[in-house]
């Protein structure tokens, strides 16, 4: 039998000799030559050798654990003389022994993390990794310390874990928002002679919000003539934050003051600023000043950071109306009027009203202003600024109708007031699906029944535009003696499929089907679309090989287009039947 | 799975008024034209009333119009019937059925009934 | 308004027998006609839209034809879930009508 333990090699071995491994044995060796050794499988003759006659292994390679940690191989002994095995072929290991030839590795070679400025000492920043080659069953090659190299005192590492945390409190992004940590990593435990990695941690400082809103200035003053019509800006003010984002956000409001209900702050989102606007018509003769306490806040405190004071500032506005003849003021700013798209001419959609608001109070006429009515479409009653249609609408044509109507004094021409009214027309199911695209294709002469040979899709024009729900089906004319049947799937699409085992292009070398398309919409709408269908010659994959070469030719007037209704015209067989077209009616 | 579920029905007296709902599952409610149909207990079916799937136009069968009004919220994919001066004879099973033409989808129906 | 007319009011079959309701229309309706089955107390369902197509989920035994004003609804084996009131129904012209049914009882 075969005398050995498993063999144990070092990696990485230096030495001029070839390293020796150790002996293959059989007890049958009387050590007189009669025996020959021969080894097999992993790097046998290249990396590792056998003396064969006395089954002495030697590695003549230097080998590295990490590339290859074991090799399998096998051991034969046969008797010279015979040729024959004096043992059977045995598998053997030859395990490749590990030294720390391997520095630990960082997963990457730059970090990026965040930390809330502010943040409590240990918070968890980020976890870094290295990870070691070497073997981590044997010896210390392979435990990795973490420690930090530069970014103190601001954050410390777990030695075992890689976790950064913060090590200093109050760090204020304000005064500083970028850090650069170096970390560490070092093999054998941290211990002397241990191979080490280096890795970058760039910390930024993320936001937190510690910093309240100030006006620059005490008092504000603006002037506003008093048509200012509501939602007019009257001027602008301005809190600043050291903070950023959304814990720079400021939201402004009127605290106090004798213009409360006369006057709005609201914020431009993207300025910050506080826009003051006038909330309600204005009146010279009745007030000239307004003083408002406008405040601006934080709207995104957090309560931690109250025992700084209070998230908040307030200033002192104040508004000065200037006197103006005025000219008239509608009610709205704005109309939005509908209508239906099937609306008669003469219907009324609505009506707008203006008046002088001067003492004087002059009447006033109405007028559409016909730079934005080209087309006459509408018209407005001049006396009691009634809108009425004057022509046919159409919404698939036009959805909104943005026309101007102008109030005039009739005392005073040259005082008018302009309000835009948004007429919306509303959809009437006034359109029928048709095919989404000019259908023509072919069947194969040795088709088999229920070939599917096209799918068809429709559209249609009316609302909803993606909602619709569509059925096909063959025009009744059609239907009875027809070569094809349609499948609707019900899906929004149908499928044409042949209705027979094989067709002759010689006897009949198009087909034209009506297909009927309709909606689910109220009134259904439907309409007619014509597939042109031409019997061809094909390989056995199916393929179009050469259909009939005459082109297809129609009567003036015919088309076989999406949506085309054919109908019968005396002399129109003869000219189909010609071209060997199959008339469906 | 679609669902229709009406609700709202009950007794009430000539000249009164009832609001029917039929609240819409399982599909695309803003999509499809919804209608109303009545059946007379012991009579066949009668066609009420249909609404467009945006809102926009409303159709209604003479003998109710003037009096009945359909609508519906989207948002809240449910369907209305308002039905004012109620008589006799509009003592039926009110379904509400999804599409505008054919009604591949009712509800289970709800019973008004105008009696003095 | 389009008068839709069912024909038998009623008819008695049994159990595997081919059953054939008709629907004539007072106009011609094109294609536009619908069938539709109700049983006692339950809302009625959708069999067949456009004439002749099949809703989905309804058994291939129900089949429709025709066009113009002469509609038919064949059953071709009667089974046991098939008792019930069949309606016709035209969408080519408001107001929509319906036929006045047609039950379907047992022999």
């Known amino acids: 039998s075969w005398m050995w333990n498993q063999f144990f090699l070092l990696e990485e071995y230096t030495g001029s000799d070839y390293q020796y491994v150790g002996k293959l044995h059989s007890d049958q060796d009387r050590g007189d030559g009669s025996l020959k050794y021969i080894l097999s499988g992993d790097g046998a003759g290249d990396l590792f050798i056998i003396n064969e006659n006395t089954g002495d292994i030697q590695a003549t390679k230097r080998l590295d654990r990490e590339e290859k940690p074991v090799y399998i191989l096998r051991a034969q002994a046969i008797n010279r003389r015979t040729g024959r095995p004096v043992e059977p072929e045995s598998e053997f290991i030859i395990k490749i022994h590990d030294i720390n030839d391997n520095e630990p590795i960082f997963t990457k070679d730059v970090y990026t993390a965040t930390v809330p400025e502010m943040a409590d000492v240990g918070t968890f920043v980020v976890q870094v990794t290295a990870t070691d080659a070497d073997d981590p069953t044997y010896g210390n090659s392979a435990k990795v310390v973490y420690s930090i190299l530069q970014g103190q005192p601001y954050f410390s590492v777990e030695s075992e874990t890689g976790i950064i945390k913060t090590a200093l409190l109050n760090m204020d992004r304000e005064n500083r928002e970028q850090y650069q940590v170096v970390i560490q990593a070092k093999d054998m435990g941290g211990q002397m002679g241990g191979l080490s990695g280096t890795t970058t941690v760039n910390i930024t400082l993320t936001d937190v919000n510690d910093n309240p809103p100030r006006f620059p200035q005490s008092t504000y003053q603006f002037k506003t003539p008093e048509s200012s019509p509501p939602g007019t800006p009257i001027g602008r003010i301005k809190a600043s934050d050291a903070d950023v984002g959304e814990n720079a956000e400021i939201e402004y409001s009127i605290t106090d003051g004798e213009g409360h209900d006369m006057f709005d702050v609201i914020t431009d989102q993207e300025t910050q600023e506080g826009i003051i606007t006038v909330k309600k018509l204005l009146d010279f003769e009745k007030k000239r000043v307004y003083t408002l306490k406008v405040e601006a806040s934080n709207p995104h405190i957090e309560p931690r950071f109250l025992y700084l004071g209070p998230f908040k500032d307030s200033a002192t506005v104040r508004i000065v109306v200037d006197d103006v003849d005025e000219p008239p003021v509608f009610s709205k700013l704005a109309y939005i009027l509908q209508i239906r798209e099937d609306a008669q001419i003469n219907t009324t959609i609505g009506s707008v009203a203006a008046q002088d608001p001067d003492a004087a109070r002059n009447p006033v006429k109405y007028s559409v202003d016909r730079h934005t009515d080209m087309d006459r479409i509408f018209n407005i009653d001049s006396g009691n600024g009634s809108i009425f249609t004057s022509k046919l609408l159409d919404r698939e044509t036009l959805l909104w109708h943005n026309i101007t109507v102008i109030a005039t004094e009739i005392n005073n021409p040259k005082q008018s007031s302009r309000v835009p009214l948004y007429i919306k027309v509303l959809d009437v199911n006034d359109n029928a699906p048709e095919f989404a695209e000019f259908y023509e294709t072919f069947v194969c002469e040795k088709a088999k029944a229920d070939q599917l040979i096209q799918t068809l899709h429709a559209v249609d024009k009316d609302d909803p535009y993606s909602g619709h729900q569509f059925s096909f089906s063959l025009a009744p004319e059609a239907a009875s003696g027809s070569n094809f049947t349609i499948q609707d799937n019900k899906d929004n699409t149908a499928g044409i499929l042949t209705r027979k085992n094989g067709y002759n292009r010689h006897e009949m070398s198009t087909y034209l089907l009506p297909v009927v398309i309709s909606d689910n919409d109220y009134p259904v709408q439907s309409s007619t679309g014509t597939v042109t269908v031409r019997v061809c010659a094909c390989d056995h994959h199916g393929n179009m090989q050469s259909c009939h070469a005459e082109a297809l030719i129609h009567p003036t007037g015919l088309s076989t287009g999406a949506g085309s209704e054919f109908r019968h015209d005396s002399g129109l067989n003869d000219i189909f039947e010609a071209q060997k077209i199959e008339w469906h009616e | 799975q679609v669902q229709l579920l009406e609700s709202g029905g009950g007794l009430v007296q000539p000249g009164g008024s009832l609001r029917l709902s039929c609240a819409a599952s399982?599909?695309?409610?803003?999509?499809?034209?919804m209608s109303w149909v009545r059946q007379a207990p012991g009579k066949g079916l009668e066609w009420v009333s249909v609404?467009?799937?945006?809102?926009?136009?409303?159709y209604y069968a003479d003998s109710v119009k003037g009096r009945f009004t359909i609508s519906r919220d989207n948002s809240k994919n449910t369907l209305y019937l308002q039905m004012n001066s109620l008589r006799a004879e509009d003592t039926a099973v009110y379904y509400c059925?999804?599409?505008?033409?054919?009604?591949?989808?009712w509800g289970q129906g709800t019973l008004v009934t105008v009696s003095s | 308004d389009i008068q839709m007319t069912q024909s038998p009011s009623s008819l008695s079959a049994s159990v595997g027998d081919r059953v054939t309701i008709t629907c004539r229309a007072s106009?011609?309706?094109?294609?536009?006609l619908n069938w539709y089955q109700q049983k006692p107390g339950k809302a009625p369902k959708l069999l067949i839209y456009?004439?002749?197509t099949l809703q989905s989920g309804v058994p291939s035994r129900f089949s429709g034809s025709g066009s113009g004003t002469d509609f038919t609804l064949t059953i071709s084996s009667l089974q046991p879930e098939d008792f019930a009131t069949y309606y016709c129904?035209?969408?080519?012209?408001?107001?929509?009508?319906f036929g006045q049914g047609t039950k379907v009882e047992i022999k």
């Open positions: 059925a999804r599409g505008g033409g054919y009604f591949d989808y």
């Open positions: 399982g599909f695309t409610f803003s999509s499809y034209a």
């Open positions: 609404i467009r799937s945006s809102g926009s136009s409303t």
């Open positions: 106009q011609s309706i094109s294609l536009w």
């Open positions: 456009a004439a002749s």
């Open positions: 129904q035209q969408y080519y012209t408001s107001p929509y009508t």
